[in-house]
Amino acid sequence: EDELQVIQPEKSVSVAAGESATLCCAMTSLIPVGPIMWFRGAGAGRELIYNQKEGHFPRVTTVSELTKRNNLDFSISISNITPADAGTYYCVKFRKGSPDDVEFKSGAGTELSVRAKPSAPVVSGPAVRATPEHTVSFTCESHGFSPRDITLKWFKNGNELSDFQTNVDPAGDSVSYSIHSTARVVLTRGDVHSQVICEMAHITLQGDPLRGTANLSEAIRVPPTLEVTQQPMRAENQANVTCQVSNFYPRGLQLTWLENGNVSRTETASTLIENKDGTYNWMSWLLVNTCAHRDDVVLTCQVEHDGQQAVSKSYALEIS
Amino acid sequence: EDELQVIQPEKSVSVAAGESATLCCAMTSLIPVGPIMWFRGAGAGRELIYNQKEGHFPRVTTVSELTKRNNLDFSISISNITPADAGTYYCVKFRKGSPDDVEFKSGAGTELSVRAKPSAPVVSGPAVRATPEHTVSFTCESHGFSPRDITLKWFKNGNELSDFQTNVDPAGDSVSYSIHSTARVVLTRGDVHSQVICEMAHITLQGDPLRGTANLSEAIRVPPTLEVTQQPMRAENQANVTCQVSNFYPRGLQLTWLENGNVSRTETASTLIENKDGTYNWMSWLLVNTCAHRDDVVLTCQVEHDGQQAVSKSYALEIS
């Protein structure tokens, strides 16, 4: 009779996390008599998965009735697969021996790869705001996926970005993987309403990619433009001067009026007008009593925006 | 080299409807060269499931790359399994020939059984009502399940019944099965609120049986008991006689008073009193003017309940 062969027909099996994995194994002969065992891995550190003879293996069921005398099928099913179950599984025939059974022949092994979905991508932006024309970095992270192959793209308002760098870790074999990508985005004044999107495609997602988003409103500071103008006189001896603060973001803004360098009034912007692009406008006015001045007066509108260094605009009021 | 063997390790595979079925097949040798095919069934009428050489098989995917020169694994996966896919699948090796390839060797076959859930059980009762102490039949039907093994139990108010007969059709092999069970239930006067339950356990239900119910209120008729009594006189020359109609079900009831066999009044029961057991009570009274009678009067309370033959109770009123 031909010597027993251990047939593991599948070189590899791929299973989605949470499903059951069936690992096929067949013998070509009933002899020599002795049990079979399934191991994950080879060599001294191999892990026992199933022992026909003894032990409790709650996640393992046999496809056939292994107690039947003429059984040649030693396929098993492992329930509730997780990425930690990935590896090469060997069906090993033992012959009876004493004091212990003796390993007789091993199958070629079946590599079990576990398809695990990536976690929802988390996109984070810069710690401090930057102004238009500057470049800021966004990162996108996701974990726990398998296999390693994954595609990541960046978009800004639907337009694909090209300036990014992606790493998948670890570089070698692992039960699951993580991805980390950094995209560099050049800010423009109109970016308050803009959004960056990190999009990931993976075999487990069946063509329905995962997306993580971040709003550029968290990353951008648009400094205001100032314009000081004199309005028509409301009354004799009274000048009305306005400071138009335009196109700033975010909201936080403090304005100080100075008359010839001396602080006249300080106020915090409250009722703002929002522009279509998401920036804000605000106007402040100062009534100057010209009776109190013999000479010309220099009025200065000084604005501190979002904790930055103050900017100012002056206006020379002629006393006629 | 040993002659090629076709190894189908699993004698049987069981798959839930809607899932994919993996059918394992391995060759022990690369020669003779030639394609493999998968068939369902054997003999002249066998059905081609997959042909490695040619054809379009949208539901079939191969586990391995069959185009690789040294491939010995010819396992396939069939998607979206339905009960109609049940059967024995054979992996068949052909050797190249002219004009046609020649069948060389077949695997032993893998029987694919499809686990399909039974439909929700429908319980129906008798077409006509029956009275207590009589036996009525209830039927329970369910369809579309597989495998054939199924357990059906009957309960009345939580107590298991033993007098029933169950058939699973067809008797022979089939892609799916139907069950029909008839239970015989002895009615009691207190059964208006009773319920019969048909409970089915099947491997696909994971220990959570399906139940169908029917209310015995649809099947039972509890005939009334009648009691005619004379009440104390309200006024001289006037006798008050009541007819107490007790413990009947269903509601429909018509009562006729007769004086010495002549119809005095007919009325339909409306405002009923419901008892705890679901039956109803009703009372009717008749005022008899004794001046109009010289001799004794026989008063009869005649009740027609639920379209059945009338029952009556008489009372002799003495004219003093």
Epitope: V33, G34, L66, N71 | -
Partner: antibody, heavy 120, light 107 residues
Framework: QVQLVQSGAEVKKPGASVKVSCKAS????????ISWVRQAPGQGLEWMGW????????NYAQKLQGRVTMTTDTSTSTAYMELRSLRSDDTAVYYC?????????????WGRGTLVTVSS | DIQMTQSPSSVSASVGDRVTITCRAS??????LAWYQQKPGKAPKLLIY???NLQSGVPSRFSGSGSGTDFTLTISSLQPEDFATYYC?????????FGGGTKVEIK
């Protein structure tokens, strides 16, 4: 056909040795183990030991350790059981049995038995 | 060593009777139990292996059940040729041990 043929009855004196043979035919001898089981007159079955016909490993019952030796000759598909220092309570029918379980031990094929009588 | 206790030691029954023999192991042996039939002057014959599997060629009136420590051999309808002694045997580990036997006699 598949069978185990044992050697004939033996009469031995106390202190002597006996060697019983068991020839297998009709199956691959090396694929199975052989156990030896004895049965004293009117008594039950007593397992004596086991030998692998493939690798020659043995396992003996504790009470017979040192007195019993089991061997095989794969060229003739024969198993042997030698029992030394015989005593009168060794009088029994000695059976060889093919052990056929894969992960357990049971005996699906038996020889007809060899009667060994120990008497002075 | 694993002790095997068989009961009853003998049973008297008639043709057509249902006969049940029990066997208890002193420790758990999974399903690794066999049942044998022995007639006078003959070698034992394997009836049941792995607690419940019918050996090829054995009539279906013989059946086995149990796992762990308690096992049963049932003869559903006793036939004339079934009058014999029955032994259980644990095959879980060395040393292999047999029960004391149950003699099924004609009533």
């Amino acid at each position: 056909q598949v069978q185990l043929v044992q050697s004939g009855a033996e009469v031995k004196k106390p202190g002597a040795s006996v060697k019983v043979s068991c020839k297998a035919s009709g199956y691959t001898f090396g694929g199975y183990g052989i156990s030896w089981v004895r049965q004293a007159p009117g008594q039950g079955l007593e397992w004596m030991g086991w030998i692998s016909a493939y690798g020659g490993e043995t396992n003996y019952a504790q009470k017979l350790q040192g007195r019993v030796t089991m061997t095989t000759d794969t060229s003739t598909s024969t198993a042997y059981m030698e029992l030394r220092s015989l005593r009168s309570d060794d009088t029994a029918v000695y059976y060889c049995a093919r052990e056929a379980g894969s992960s357990w031990y049971d005996f699906d094929l038996w020889g007809r038995g060899t009667l060994v009588t120990v008497s002075s | 060593d694993i002790q095997m206790t068989q009961s009853p030691s003998s049973v008297s029954a008639s043709v057509g009777d249902r006969v049940t023999i029990t066997c208890r192991a002193s420790q758990g042996i999974s399903s690794w139990l066999a049942w044998y039939q022995q007639k006078p002057g003959k070698a034992p014959k394997l009836l049941i292996y792995a607690a419940s599997n019918l050996q090829s060629g054995v009539p279906s009136r013989f059946s086995g059940s149990g796992s762990g420590t308690d096992f049963t051999l049932t003869i559903s309808s006793l036939q004339p040729e079934d009058f014999a002694t029955y032994y259980c045997q644990q095959g879980a580990s060395f040393p292999i041990t047999f029960g004391g036997g149950t003699k099924v006699e004609i009533k």
